[in-house]
């Protein structure tokens, strides 16, 4: 066979010989010859490889630590690495998740919109006319102010973004 | 049609050496790995030895190794296994075989090698 | 050094019959091992490469099998000039090896 310039999808070229590239899981431990296959080797425990490759070393695991405010979400196998995602009322600082922050609260005036997750912070929203929130929460939406109509009650203090409406009874000497 | 021919067989002493060619023909010799594989009378077939297309690289088992030493001469489309320090164990019929695939897909005939004293 | 065992040694059966050889690998190779067949007198001729690719020139009748460490050649339907010894061999790695052989002769 004419020594190839180009080789076929899995495969690699070296020392003008096209050379199976190891499966996902699997590192290099030699090249092919005219005479032998790619030689290649399971990667060991707490390693992996995601792609065909030449690697002659698995990539290791990620560790996720708990003193940034990590945990494990999903082990890794031979062919993938760990994801890991923060503890309760933590976020990831990053898409690659590398440490945590606290979540963040809104503050009064403001109520949660999205709740946040292992992976995205809080997003807040300032509570808009008839909505108030009084407190700093990571969880609270605006409340509706109190309708004191329906309480057969009088509007006795507007309410703000960050209080609500106060009630009272109806002013009986009015005619 | 393809061809390996090889030659330089016989009986040699224990201690002794001896030369083994393997000429080809019927094909692109120099694109192709050749191997040497022998046949003790009436056993199973054991690898001995390869050489790559352009003869950089050679391969032997850890029993031949130090002992023979193969090569090739591209232009003359030959083959040779230098067999030195012969033992009884290496009395055996020797075949060399082109490596297409990473399969030996042709074969010689064989030249017989008896080392006895 | 991977081992490679052939069994039965022999096998005897009639023509027509149906032949099956088996060769068992010492560690996973995935699919790289060639069968080879060897008549009395002859140099050994290629019959199947890659466990199961057929050869141009081979009979339909020959068939392989098998990946990782478990390999299997099937003679569909014996013919007479199919009684001969038959060897496995595995490229995954040096050196290279064959298995022992596997005679199937005339019953």
């Known amino acids: 066979p004419e020594p190839p310039t180009a080789c076929r999808e899995k495969q690699y070229l070296i020392n003008s010989q096209c050379c199976s590239l190891c499966q996902p899981g699997q590192k290099l431990v030699s090249d092919c010859t005219e005479f032998t296959e790619t030689e290649c080797l399971p990667c060991g425990e707490s390693e992996f490889l995601d792609t065909w490759n030449r690697e002659t070393h698995c990539h290791q695991h990620k560790y996720c630590d708990p003193n940034l405010g990590l945990r494990v979400q999903q082990k890794g196998t031979s062919e993938t690495d760990t994801i890991c995602t923060c503890e309760e009322g933590w976020h990831c600082t990053s898409e690659a998740c590398e440490s945590c922050v606290l979540h963040r609260s809104c503050s009064p005036g403001f109520g949660v919109k999205q709740i946040a997750t292992g992976v995205s912070d809080t997003i807040c929203e300032p509570c808009p006319v008839g909505f108030f929130s009084n407190v700093s929460s990571a969880f609270e939406k605006c409340h509706p102010w109190t309708s004191c109509e329906t309480k057969d009650l009088v509007v006795q203090q507007a309410g703000t973004n960050k209080t609500d409406v106060v009630c009272g009874p109806q002013d009986r000497l009015r005619a | 049609e393809v061809q390996l021919v090889e030659s330089g067989g016989g009986l040699v002493k224990p201690g002794g050496s001896l030369r083994l060619s393997c000429a080809a023909s019927?094909?692109?010799?120099?694109?192709?790995?050749i191997s040497w594989v022998r046949q003790a009378p009436g056993k199973g077939l054991e690898w001995v030895s390869s050489?790559?297309?352009?003869?950089?690289?050679?391969y032997y088992p850890d029993n031949v190794k130090g002992r023979f030493t193969i090569s090739r001469d591209n232009a003359k489309n030959s083959l040779y296994l230098q067999m030195n320090s012969l033992r009884a164990e290496d009395t055996a019929v020797y075949y060399c075989?082109?490596?297409?695939?990473?399969?030996?897909?042709?074969w010689g005939q064989g030249t017989l090698v008896t080392v006895s004293s | 050094e991977i081992v490679l065992t052939q069994s039965p040694a022999t096998l005897s059966l009639s023509p027509g019959e149906r032949a099956t050889l088996s060769c068992r690998a010492s560690?996973?190779?995935?699919?790289?091992l060639h069968w080879y067949q060897q008549k009395p007198g002859q140099a050994p001729r290629l019959l199947i490469k890659y466990a199961s690719q057929s050869i141009s020139g081979i009979p339909a009748r020959f068939s392989g099998s098998g990946s990782g460490t478990d390999f299997t050649l099937t003679i569909s339907s014996l013919e007479p000039e199919d009684f001969a010894v038959y060897f496995c061999?595995?490229?995954?790695?040096?050196?290279?090896?064959f298995g022992g052989g596997t005679k199937v002769e005339i019953k």
């Open positions: 061999q595995q490229f995954s790695s040096w050196p290279l090896t």
């Open positions: 050489i790559s297309s352009g003869g950089d690289n050679t």
């Open positions: 560690q996973t190779i995935n699919n790289n």
């Open positions: 075989a082109r490596a297409g695939e990473k399969a030996m897909d042709y």
């Open positions: 019927g094909f692109t010799f120099s694109n192709y790995g």
